[in-house]
Interface confidence: low
Amino acid sequence: NIDVCKLGTVTVQPAPVIPLGSAANISCSLNPKQGCSHYPSSNELILLKFVNDVLVENLHGKKVHDHTGHSSTFQVTNLSLGMTLFVCKLNCSNSQKKPPVPVCGVEISVGVAPEPPQNISCVQEGENGTVACSWNSGKVTYLKTNYTLQLSGPNNLTCQKQCFSDNRQNCNRLDLGINLSPDLAESRFIVRVTAINDLGNSSSLPHTFTFLDIVIPLPPWDIRINFLNASGSRGTLQWEDEGQVVLNQLRYQPLNSTSWNMVNATNAKGKYDLRDLRPFTEYEFQISSKLHLSGGSWSNWSESLRTRTPEEEPVGILDIWYMKQDIDYDRQQISLFWKSLNPSEARGKILHYQVTLQEVTKKTTLQNTTRHTSWTRVIPRTGAWTASVSAANSKGASAPTHINIVDLCGTGLLAPHQVSAKSENMDNILVTWQPPKKADSAVREYIVEWRALQPGSITKFPPHWLRIPPDNMSALISENIKPYICYEIRVHALSESQGGCSSIRGDSKHKAPVSGPHITAITEKKERLFISWTHIPFPEQRGCILHYRIYWKERDSTAQPELCEIQYRRSQNSHPISSLQPRVTYVLWMTAVTAAGESPQGNEREFCPQGKAN
């Protein structure tokens, strides 16, 4: 239905399909009574060559034969692989203004004969599937190439299917649509692939196989697991398989794991007992099948079964710590803290904690349950107290963890020596110490405890701590460590019934403070000036403040100011200076210094001492 070739015809010799490297002759002929005018000599036939719809050459100089005004023959050579379009046009030489008129055209295909197909592989998916074979076609032919797949077998069984390759589709697989049944398990089958195009044909070598060689079982389905007596560690995996399956492979792993547990099961008949599962853990299970112990192929893995194993009672020891605060003469507040069990110890969802405080001699016992990881009680200051905590889930409780309540910093002889805190990187601090010099009882363990030095941190936030064995003298603290924040770090040495502690401040990264302290008042007492200030707001400190500096100079002086450097103490907010002249007006200001440098100055205050100077 394309309106072309009204004016004439185009033919190609030897054929419109030629091998690579061959030449072809293209003849263009005008139909009777077609042309430019009544003078045939004014008809000029030209041949244009197009590749991918783009004009690449005018073959005017390739004429090998010419019947003036009626037909011309052109020789074309060096054609590239694939399709090339040639269009014959009529050029009327006595009418230069008119463009050439299309006459007709032809496509010449350049290609190669097919290579023998290789690497034939056949599969039948499942006992009820059909046989499908694939192969390697070899080099691209650039021509439409037909492939025929033939299968022959016992009892005169023959079957064949066809497909073709061209520039839009590739034929390297065919489904024969026939089913091989298990009763032919020992029979041999032969397949062969034949390729044919306009330039030649070729055949593969015969490929021989048996039923067991090619049948891939369907993956197991309907996978489920039963846990014996709601056990969290033992379960029976069950599934459905095709009837002929004799071997299964099972793989399973916790969902966050990167390596599978693998199990081979012979004649499992859709059931296998697993005994080493982790309680209260999300698992993924998959199964593969095989029809023969030695030969044949494994099926694809089944779809995953994802399920969580049941809970079992918690195991492991809770990590407990505490704080003591005297309330008045005969009462103290005990705050107990503990860390959550890790999942492998909790073995379920922890529902609550059982907390016990017991006075050893009088046998007074306070008991409670809580869902939190801390508990506070007021108890008498007298007596020896011990605390215990256990964690409970739906299946039971862990063994209680005990700790003796001692005066944590009560014994100077147990205080660790030479405590230092060095920033290691942005989010951890290395704490080191030396053991107590004259401990009168053995150190059972060290506790390194830290909290941010910010207002209300003692009441608002629980402490962070690490338990360190008695032969270690260092700890890398990282939990909840943020840069530009100062932490109070305590190292406790604990014996069976006593405690000693040393304290230091440290930060993981520091900058110079954003601002200096704000001078609130200057007062004169007994020939000394007392400078009072408010501390720098916590976010503006940007690390641990090492010291404050008080500067002063005479009001209109251009001389360098004098300064006094004060060791930083959180509890201190005033300091005396005594080197100012009476009845001279001074300007005073303060700065703060961290390990990274000095802050800008705080507010300036003027003051004129009245008293007698020292």
Epitope: I2, D3, V10, D53, V54, V87, G105, V106, E107
Partner: nanobody, 119 residues
Framework: QVQLQESGGGLVQAGGSLRLSCAAS??????????MAWYRQAPGKQRELVAS???????GYADSVKGRFTISRDNGKNSVYLQMNSLKPEDTAVYLC???????????WGQGTQVTVSS
């Protein structure tokens, strides 16, 4: 290189309408030298001819779409269109634009546009 680009596909309720467009671009003399056609291919099925329009204007339709679909062309815009009315769920497929040019046959195909008809 000549290219065909379809557009206008989408999700539509049964009984609804869509208009597909196919624009030709590249080193092309003119779309009026081409016989144009729309094909469609549903998952797992053979590609089938839906409608065609020759370079002289003769038109043909598959039996399954006669009376519901209309093919047209605009040579000035180098485009061909398929107006689809009274769509049915069985019309769900990837619709491909095809252009045939030259002698004796030179095929161009677009990438396709998805049409989904929900019931």
């Amino acid at each position: 290189q000549v290219q065909l680009q379809e557009s206008g596909g989408g999700l539509v309720q049964a009984g609804g309408s869509l208009r597909l467009s196919c624009a030709a671009s590249g080193s092309i003399r003119s779309i009026n030298a081409m016989a144009m056609a729309w094909y469609r291919q549903a998952p797992g099925k053979q590609r089938e001819l839906v409608a065609s329009i020759s370079n002289s204007g003769s038109i043909g339709y598959a039996d399954s779409v006669k009376g519901r679909f209309t093919i047209s062309r605009d040579n000035g815009k180098n485009s061909v269109y398929l107006q689809m009315n009274s769509l049915k769920p069985e019309d769900t497929a990837v619709y491909l634009c095809n252009g045939r040019t030259g002698w004796p046959r030179y095929d161009l195909w677009g990438q396709g546009t998805q049409v989904t008809v929900s019931s």
